[in-house]
Amino acid sequence: MEDEKPKVNPKLYMCVCEGLSCGNEDHCEGQQCFSSLSINDGFHVYQKGCFQVYEQGKMTCKTPPSPGQAVECCQGDWCNRNITAQLPTKGKSFPGTQNFHLE
């Protein structure tokens, strides 16, 4: 039987990683996972990843969605796998924008 797991530091979660900051990895490990969507030069840029240090995500995750950026955060292994951040446009798309996944 595996022994007890004392909490000597904050819990870490496995997160899906998609985007330029991920390098060759498709996952990362951190204290929070995130899924984000931003508009860059008319493109919808989707990214996923993790905040390794809780404070990194504290402000980002509390920022309400704006027409140009939305971030959703979660805590749990692979919790950002099925999360797609949505811009607050109630189903309308911005003219001249297209979807783009940063790989």
Partner: antibody, heavy 114, light 113 residues
Framework: QVQLVESGGGLVKPGGSLRLSCAAS????????MSWIRQAPGKGLEWVSY????????YYADSVKGRFTISRDNAKNSLNLQMSSLRAEDTAVYFC???????WGQGTLVTVSS | KIVLTQTPLSSPVTLGQPASISCRSS???????????LSWLHQRPGQPPRLLIY???NRLSGVPDRFSGSGAGTDFTLKISRVEAEDVGVYYC??????????FGGGTKVEIK
């Protein structure tokens, strides 16, 4: 039972390199993050480096950043620390430790001296 | 970077008598998740450290109840109610709040008078 056995320590000249290994057994290695922690002779403990369960995330103390590289091979249940540009102040016993620091190896001594 | 300062550096005690070690942090160790990641470790001569207590006051299974941890924020204490011969060695406090940058106190040597 959980076992961690370090190896690779020894005497090396300043500027030289050394590769430490830690062989793990008695638990599912890939389920745990691992750390290297060192202790200079007669001194206290200093955290050196950390690697996540899959090896995708690595962290280093400022004192070793750019000189040390941590890696792991989950298929072989092994943890490694590649040390280069070694300095006299890197002289220490190097311990590998398993999350959450309740299991430590006996340590391997690294001496950097000309 | 969080700095942990331990006092005293050395604590000579009589067998059966209590001992107390203090650990002061340069900043609060309360994490955003509400927990305080302050642990205590014990190292006997020639051996690796052994984790005794985590999140201020939780004893690891197998650790005798003569060991107790207390404190909050930046000030923490490890108490041994009745020191036994096997308790000699160096005690370290450690913070994990700023993980992965773990930091340790300088250590307190407990020896028998």
């Amino acid at each position: 039972q959980v076992q961690l056995v370090e190896s690779g320590g020894g005497l090396v000249k300043p500027g030289g390199s050394l590769r430490l290994s830690c062989a793990a057994s008695g638990f599912t290695f890939s389920d745990y993050y691992m750390s290297w922690i060192r202790q200079a002779p007669g001194k206290g403990l200093e955290w050196v480096s950390y690697i996540s369960r899959t090896g995708s995330t690595k962290y280093y103390a400022d004192s070793v950043k750019g000189r040390f590289t941590i890696s792991r091979d989950n298929a072989k249940n092994s943890l490694n620390l590649q040390m280069s540009s070694l300095r006299a102040e890197d002289t220490a016993v190097y311990f590998c430790a398993r999350e959450p620091l309740q299991h430590w190896g006996q340590g391997t001594l690294v001496t950097v001296s000309s | 970077k969080i700095v942990l300062t331990q006092t005293p550096l050395s604590s000579p005690v009589t067998l059966g008598q209590p001992a107390s070690i203090s650990c002061r942090s340069s900043q609060s160790l309360v994490h955003s998740d509400g927990d305080t990641y302050l642990s205590w470790l014990h190292q006997r001569p020639g051996q690796p450290p052994r984790l005794l207590i985590y999140t201020i006051s939780n004893r690891l299974s197998g650790v005798p109840d003569r060991f107790s941890g207390s404190g909050a924020g930046t000030d923490f204490t490890l108490k041994i109610s009745r020191v036994e011969a096997e308790d000699v060695g160096v005690y370290y406090c450690m913070q994990g709040t700023q993980f992965p940058a773990l930091t340790f106190g300088g250590g307190t040597k407990v020896e028998i008078k």
